[in-house]
Amino acid sequence: ILWHEQWHEGLEEASRLYFGDRNVKGMFEILEPLHAMLERGPQTLKETSFSQAYGRELTEAYEWSQRYKTSAVVMDLDRAWDIYYHVFQKISRHHHHHH
């Protein structure tokens, strides 16, 4: 499955777990493998393109979410989700232009 599809569905599912169920553990269980995949680095041209387009913002969001783990300040997680949604929007719109 293409990276943009995995992130698209993963972010939606994680958002429902967090905002709908307040299930932070479940949210991290979805996000952590996606970030690990990104951290391993791209192996195809499409993955390289994805990494260039969204890598910096996704890493920033991840840093805010990791900060929450030590701070327990909900605002840190909200900052992460602002960025995640921003990326989700871009993926939704970008996908249309290339398919």
Partner: antibody
């Protein structure tokens, strides 16, 4: 209370231009997606365009791409649809609607508030 | 673009009937489907979002479900105020697309 009020519709000749406005209250246009959806007389709903001001993202239906421009003035909490090179087939009631993911707990866009609509008639 | 094929285009039913409207997506759209009700001369109203979540204030007789790329809106017991046109909409990827609509009329 959330409200969307469209204005700017009217009668215009083919090839002409109109600018529709969507004045929002009760929420922040900056952090919401604003959509324009139209409905030709006796027909179904057709999505036209949307804007997400937070990231300056815009998208258009193929039928209006290159002719219509969606924008927002966050200081006025208002979205706009600039319509150029209008055609008879653009005749419709134009609705603006919003999606605010903070309200829905879902990223998938469902339009929870709609304006009353403004009629655009393209005819000579 | 993702096509949403809605059926039937119209149906006649009586008060108290169970009514089912279906939308089929031309490709996977996950659960990114919403349902709207529209009455003549009025703006659409949101009923269901994310395929099966009931929007606040909407009566519980309305429900939504998903099976793969097939999405269903069910009205368990049709009420007089439910006679209207219903639309499905996908927002998985842009452009957003609507179904053609289903007009629910009084038998």
């Amino acid at each position: 209370e959330v409200q969307l009020v469209e204005s700017g519709g009217g009668l215009v000749q083919p090839g002409g231009s109109l600018r529709l406005s969507c004045a929002a209250s009760g929420f922040n246009v900056y952090s919401s997606s604003i959509h324009w959806v139209r409905q030709a007389p006796g027909k179904g709903l057709e999505w036209v365009a949307s804007i997400y001001s937070y990231s300056s993202s815009t998208s258009y239906a193929d039928s209006v791409k290159g002719r219509f421009t969606i924008s927002a003035d966050t200081s006025k909490n208002t979205a706009y649809l600039q319509m150029n090179s209008l055609r008879a087939e653009d005749t419709a009631v134009y609705y603006c609607a919003r999606f605010d993911w903070y309200q829905r707990y879902s990223f998938y866009e469902a339009m929870d508030y709609w304006g009353q609509g403004t009629l655009v008639t393209v005819s000579s | 673009d993702i096509q949403m094929t809605q059926s039937p285009s119209s149906l006649s039913a009586s008060v108290g009937d169970r009514v089912t409207i279906t939308c089929r997506a031309s490709q996977s759209v996950s659960s990114a489907v919403a349902w709207y009700q529209q009455k003549p001369g009025k703006a659409p109203k949101l009923l269901i979002y994310s395929a099966s979540s009931l929007y606040s204030g909407v009566p519980s007789r309305f429900s939504g479900s998903r099976s793969g790329t097939d999405f269903t809106l069910t009205i368990s017991s049709l009420q007089p105020e439910d006679f209207a046109t219903y639309y499905c909409q996908q927002s998985y990827f842009y452009p957003v697309t609507f179904g053609q609509g289903t007009k629910v009329e009084i038998k």
